[in-house]
Interface confidence: low
């Protein structure tokens, strides 16, 4: 079993998922409001998000003094924040400027990919080898939307017997897409494009937040049991809290190198040939070439115009 | 490191009933399932059923129903299986095994030493 | 309930030798949406409780010889000893936990 990577408001967490009894390690300490958080395994990296500080930051786990900003303006609650770890950027979402964005996993290069038709965005997961997002909106007209890496091909995938979609995550070896409700108190799971939809846990839970998963056990964050919780991914069975006594349970992971399987990197290669930002694509060659906010691409698809 | 250690032998008059522990250390006792497994002389393995130390709910063999009850301790990390009514039917080694996370149908990864049970008038 | 059959009941082999048993179960334990056969194969020596040898049918536990080897799906399976050595002296016992009841077959005993 895994360990697990929480946030927990003022604090970064980490607790052994089989032995959720014991103390959990204090990753980051002395944190405002840690809502979302992430890591990127092959390069010692951990990011959050705060939402009071209105920032993301992130820290090298085996070196806890490090702490960065990695993006310090233009965010006013910036709830959900996930990692490309193949082709090394940093998305999340902002649920009151209403906005998707996209950057290099030091903050640079940013861009915003998303900012109509969006309410209350919140989680969002990443599937780099395909090339495509899929985020949680719990707004006036709740849904669960898949779209490109790189923008392209939005669509809404789930917008029934949806109310709250809080925890969101990605059955990478299965294809399968897990999300939590905290107003139907379910736990559904369905095909990566929005078919074949089953409950997994039916409509018996507090309050669940944030959803990870790690092999055949999915673990999620409760706000009002104060815990974090497991089952069976496949059947529900053996339902538990596997760790309590938790300030304020917010995001979580399984921190593991197997959640984040390698492949290969349709960017790896001279950047794809971009100047600038190079974007994970659903469709042939993979990649996208794409610029900051505010920048144009020119004709040959490449490159970023002067100013950037 | 991973131990279950069980009550040692039981001789016992037909009609009594017996009570069987198993002593649980060096994991997360409460995070796994606890097995019950019964081997009577020179046969094959019979599963009675499991208790999930958490919340300490069951599942029995429809054999055993009747026959076993199993219990858990959680302050002691003690799981017990109480049989009754014992006849010579009942003479075997049983073993407690510990199963998977409480989470996913599992084999047993460790298992106890066996207590010897012989009812005999 | 599954029922598990194994054979030969017993087989006597030399130090050296390559040995397969096999395991036959009344109904398929490959579980369609992971696609992973629920067997698991367990070693018992005289006077000791079993030890797991095999899960998933062809995964080895930890610290167990890579001599040992299981493989099958769905109502068949094997257990390969690929040279036997005279501690593998045993009862083999097969087992699925596809659905309660679990069961096991009646064993294969090694003798040397």
């Known amino acids: 079993a895994p360990l697990l990577l929480y946030a927990n408001r003022r604090d970064l967490r980490l607790v052994d998922a089989t032995n959720g009894k014991e103390n959990a390690t204090i990753v980051v300490g002395g944190l405002e409001d840690a809502a979302a958080v992430d890591f990127v395994f092959s390069h010692g990296l951990i990011y959050w998000s705060d939402v009071s500080e209105e920032a993301i930051k992130r820290t090298e786990f085996n070196k806890t003094e490090s702490v960065q900003n990695v993006v310090v303006s233009g965010l006013l609650s910036p709830d959900g924040l996930a990692c490309d770890w193949l082709g090394e950027k940093l998305y999340w979402t902002d649920s009151e400027t209403n906005r998707i964005e996209v950057s290099n996993l030091d903050g640079s290069l940013r861009k915003v990919l998303f900012w109509q038709e969006l309410d209350q965005p919140r989680a969002i997961a990443l599937d780099p080898s395909s090339g495509f997002m899929y985020w949680t909106d719990w707004g006036e007209v709740p849904k669960i939307e898949r779209a490109g890496m790189d923008g392209s091909s939005r669509f809404i995938i789930i917008n029934s017997e949806i109310y709250w979609p809080n925890g969101l995550t990605l059955d990478y070896e299965e294809q399968k897409l897990y999300w939590a409700d905290a107003k139907l108190n379910f736990i559904h799971k369905s095909n990566l494009d929005g078919t074949n939809r089953q409950a997994v846990v039916k409509g018996s839970l507090p309050h669940p937040f944030a959803l990870t998963l790690f092999e055949d056990i999915l673990y999620w964050t409760d706000w009002s049991t104060h815990s974090i919780l497991a089952c069976n991914k496949y059947t529900g069975e053996g339902l538990r809290e596997i760790h309590s006594d938790i300030f304020s349970p917010m995001d979580i992971h399984a921190f593991s190198q197997q959640r984040q399987p390698n492949a290969t990197n349709p960017c790896g290669i001279d950047n794809g040939g971009c100047s600038h930002l190079c974007l994970m694509s659903p469709v042939k060659p993979f990649y996208q070439c794409a610029c900051p906010t505010g920048v144009k691409l020119l004709e040959n698809g490449k490159t970023c115009k002067d100013g950037a | 490191e991973i131990q279950l250690q069980q009550s040692g032998p039981e001789l016992v008059k037909p009609g009594a009933s017996v009570k069987v522990s198993c002593k649980a250390s060096g994991y997360a006792f409460t995070s796994y399932n606890m097995y019950w497994v019964k081997q009577s002389h020179g046969k094959s393995l019979e599963w009675i059923g499991y208790?999930?130390?958490?919340?300490?709910?069951?599942n029995y063999n429809q054999k055993f129903k009747g026959k076993a009850t199993l219990t858990v301790d959680k302050s002691s990390s003690t799981a017990y299986m109480h049989l009754n009514s014992l006849t010579s039917e009942d003479s075997a080694v049983y073993y407690c095994?510990?199963?998977?996370?409480?989470?996913?149908?599992?084999?047993?990864?460790?298992w106890g030493q066996g207590t010897t049970l012989t009812v005999s008038s | 309930d599954i029922v598990m059959s194994q054979s030969p009941s017993s087989l006597a082999v030399s130090v050296g030798e390559k040995v397969t048993m096999s395991c036959k179960s009344s109904?398929?334990?490959?579980?369609?949406?992971?696609?992973?056969?629920?067997l698991a194969w367990y070693q018992q020596k005289p006077g000791q409780s079993p030890k797991v040898l095999i899960y998933?049918?062809?995964t080895r536990e930890s610290g167990v010889p890579d001599r040992f080897t299981g493989s099958g799906s769905g109502t068949d399976f094997t257990l390969t000893i690929s040279s036997v050595k005279a501690e593998d002296l045993a009862v083999y016992y097969c087992q699925q936990y596809y659905s309660y009841p679990y069961t096991f077959g009646g064993g294969t005993k090694l003798e040397i």
């Open positions: 095994a510990r199963g998977g996370m409480g989470l996913r149908r599992d084999y047993f990864d460790f």
């Open positions: 998933w049918a062809s």
């Open positions: 208790i999930d130390p958490y919340n300490g709910g069951t």
């Open positions: 109904q398929s334990l490959l579980y369609s949406s992971n696609q992973k056969n629920y």
